[in-house]
């Protein structure tokens, strides 16, 4: 039977610079059984090299000289009585870039170079990058395992040295974030931000990085009330809102959460299966009425909590004022003012610019005041004659402003008649 | 009295971020919301999104809702605005302002001095 | 999305006319609109606020009215220092959208 020498290896072979790879190789060659039994070595070299005098890349007899460049790095793998010629290529250099034979040598007989089947391996740029595993969803509080490898690495070389960078690792100590592995204990402001692992080949130049973003689960840590763009105060989950009657109100219940809440709006202070007012983080009032004083909730739903803040909503007007209006009676002339404002208005009343406080003394007036519904009334008496023209005004104010009425009455019953002077406002 | 001081002028190349600063003084800083401003040169203004520290609200115009990014740094009183994949579209002036605390609505009282960012190759 | 339509887009006056701006919402924005000034180069400045109050510091020939839809800011008697660009802006929701703006220009 015709000796045969045969190498399967495949011709070219690329791999990412700081990367490994497996190279499958086989071979066969003529041997023997009753031939003697010396051992069988096995060689890969660099293209060109002179066997007999060269260093190997690799190889499995302990005698001969291996390049230093390529110790540890390049190795058969495999078992060579099998007929195994398999290479692995660890921590790949740009200097690794070339061509390679494979030799086989058994006793004085079997001394064979496979110049045909030569293997060219290429050494590209890194542009793998790690990946970065960990269970989602992140959860804030929840402490989560994070890990951080590069596919296709393998042991081979220097080891690798990994940094880890975010906002999210501020607190962590600098051991910790040079491991492939750490915990994250996310917090809600964490969502969003960046977590960057970065691999690097000690001693080498080659580095690679992941960035992720961090989606981060979070139940609304607070509640803001927006009036058109304004927060509103809140103090022990509860805002106070003073607004004009009549006046237009649009508010925007906002809790930061991820995923988002669902906000809603509720009449006063609800029960928690009460039915909404509003099934958006929207409220909006085209024209606030006194009826609706008192309270609205904002609640915020999540599937990790809730918050709710109440609003107390105050509904105020400036004070409206009919008259003065005056007219002669029996006991002398009576002027009447009627005014509405919430809150209730204080009202005075003066003669020339001079207030009139309570009833005076000597009986000259006298001040009375009642209320009905949302209109108070007040009336002023003035006994006796007038011995000169005179001004009568009434004025009504509350914190939120004020107006005032005034008439003008004439010297002599005569001129002022029994009719009514309506206010000159 | 609020005062906004915004970082300069930006040259930056197609398809880049960019991150403008406003940092906020005169006031406090949580308690009132900071809106952004767009306007191309010779051109209108273009409200952009508020950003209210007090709470981390954000509230986006959906037109730049891809585009901007608004956060805020507390500590610093500063709120950021960062343009992604920048397009000559994006070269403008950027404004931040705030508002009075006593209003009833965001009217702008005070403005930054505006950040000019060009986008070129 | 509330749109504010401003006009006119530009506006030729002389020191001591009187002119008038107006800006048309597509919704009813309450009154809750602002009127700003724009000068070459400069950062907007707020003149008035709540549809017709002006703020502090800003002239009274400076004027804002209307409700509902319909809004003006009026500048009586014009003055050197009001040439300039003029912007509406309403606050009722968000987008908080500015009319296209008013060039005034010296005649």
């Known amino acids: 039977e015709k000796p045969v020498y045969e190498l399967q290896v495949q011709k070219s072979v690329t791999v990412q610079e700081g990367l490994c790879v497996l190279v499958p190789c086989s071979f066969s060659y003529p041997w023997r059984s009753w031939y003697s039994s010396p051992p069988l070595y096995v060689y890969w070299f660099r293209d060109g090299e002179i066997p007999y005098y060269a260093e190997v890349v690799a190889t499995n007899n302990p005698d001969r000289r291996v390049k230093p460049e390529t110790q540890g790095r390049f190795r058969l793998l495999g078992d060579v009585q099998k007929k195994n010629c398999s290479l692995s290529i660890g921590d790949a250099r740009m200097e690794d870039t070339g061509s390679y034979f494979f030799r086989v040598e058994r006793g004085r007989d079997v001394k064979y170079s496979y110049q045909q089947n030569k293997l060219n391996l290429e050494v590209t740029a890194l542009i793998e990058k790690p990946d970065i595993h960990f269970l989602e969803p992140l959860e804030s509080g929840r402490p989560t395992r994070l890990s951080c490898s590069l596919p296709g690495s393998c042991e081979a070389g220097p080891p690798l040295t990994f940094s880890w960078t975010g906002n999210a690792l501020s607190p962590l100590d600098p051991e910790t974030t040079r491991s492939s592995e750490l915990t994250l204990t996310p917090r809600p402001e964490d969502h969003g931000t960046n977590l960057t692992c970065q691999m690097k080949r000690q001693g080498a130049q080659v580095t690679t990085e992941r960035t992720v973003q961090l989606n981060v689960s979070y139940a609304p840590q607070t509640i803001t009330i927006f009036r058109n763009g304004i927060a509103l105060e809140i103090l022990q989950n509860t805002s106070y809102l003073p607004v004009l009657e009549g006046q237009a109100l649009r508010l925007l219940c906002d809790a930061p959460s991820n995923p988002p809440a669902h906000l809603s709006w509720f009449q006063g202070s609800p029960a928690l299966n009460a039915t909404p007012i509003s099934n958006t983080g929207i409220l909006e009032l085209r024209r606030v009425r006194s009826a609706e004083e008192g309270g609205f909730t904002c609640r915020a739903q999540h599937p990790l909590g809730f918050l709710q803040i109440f609003l107390n909503l105050s509904v105020y007007s400036l004070p409206q004022l009919l008259g003065p209006s005056c007219s002669w009676e029996a006991e002398g002339l009576h002027c009447r003012c009627s005014f509405r404002a919430r809150p209730a208005p204080s009202l005075c009343w003066r003669l020339e610019e001079k207030p009139l406080e309570g009833n005076s003394s000597q009986g000259s007036f006298k001040v009375n005041s009642s209320s009905a519904g949302p209109w108070a009334n007040s009336s002023l008496i003035l006994h006796g004659g007038l011995s000169s023209d005179l001004k009568v005004s009434c004025k009504a104010w509350n914190i939120y402003g004020s107006q005032s009425g005034s008439v003008l009455l004439l010297q002599g019953r005569s001129n002022l008649g029994t009719g009514v002077v309506p206010a000159a406002l | 009295q609020a005062y906004l001081q915004q970082s300069g002028a930006e040259l930056v190349k197609p398809g880049a971020s960019v991150k403008l600063s406003c940092k906020a003084s005169g006031y406090i800083f949580t308690e009132y919301t900071i809106h952004w401003v767009k306007q191309r040169s010779g051109q209108g203004l273009e409200w952009i999104g508020w950003?209210?520290?007090?709470?981390?609200?954000?509230k986006y115009n959906e037109k730049f809702k891809d585009k901007a990014t608004l956060t805020a740094d507390k500590s610093s009183s500063t709120v950021y605005m960062e343009l992604s994949r920048l397009t000559s579209e994006d070269s403008a002036v950027y404004f931040c302002?705030?508002?009075?605390?006593?209003?009833?609505?965001?009217?702008?009282?005070?403005w930054g001095q505006g950040t000019l960012v060009t986008v070129s190759a | 999305d509330v749109q504010m339509n401003q006009s006119p887009a530009s506006l030729s006056a002389s020191v001591g006319e009187t002119v008038t701006i107006t800006c048309r919402a597509s919704g009813n924005i309450h009154n809750y609109l602002a009127w700003y000034q724009q000068k070459q180069g400069k950062s907007p400045q707020l003149l008035v606020y709540n549809a017709k109050t002006l703020t502090d510091g800003v002239p009274s020939r400076f004027s804002g009215s209307g409700s509902g839809t319909q809004y003006s800011l009026k500048i009586n008697t014009l003055q050197p220092e009001d040439f300039g660009s003029y912007y509406c802006?309403?606050?009722?929701?968000?987008?908080?959208?500015f009319g296209g703006g008013t060039k005034l220009e010296m005649k």
């Open positions: 950003f209210y520290p007090g709470s981390g609200s954000i």
């Open positions: 302002a705030t508002h009075e605390r006593a209003a009833q609505a965001a009217w702008s009282a005070y």
């Open positions: 802006q309403h606050f009722w929701s968000t987008p908080y959208t």
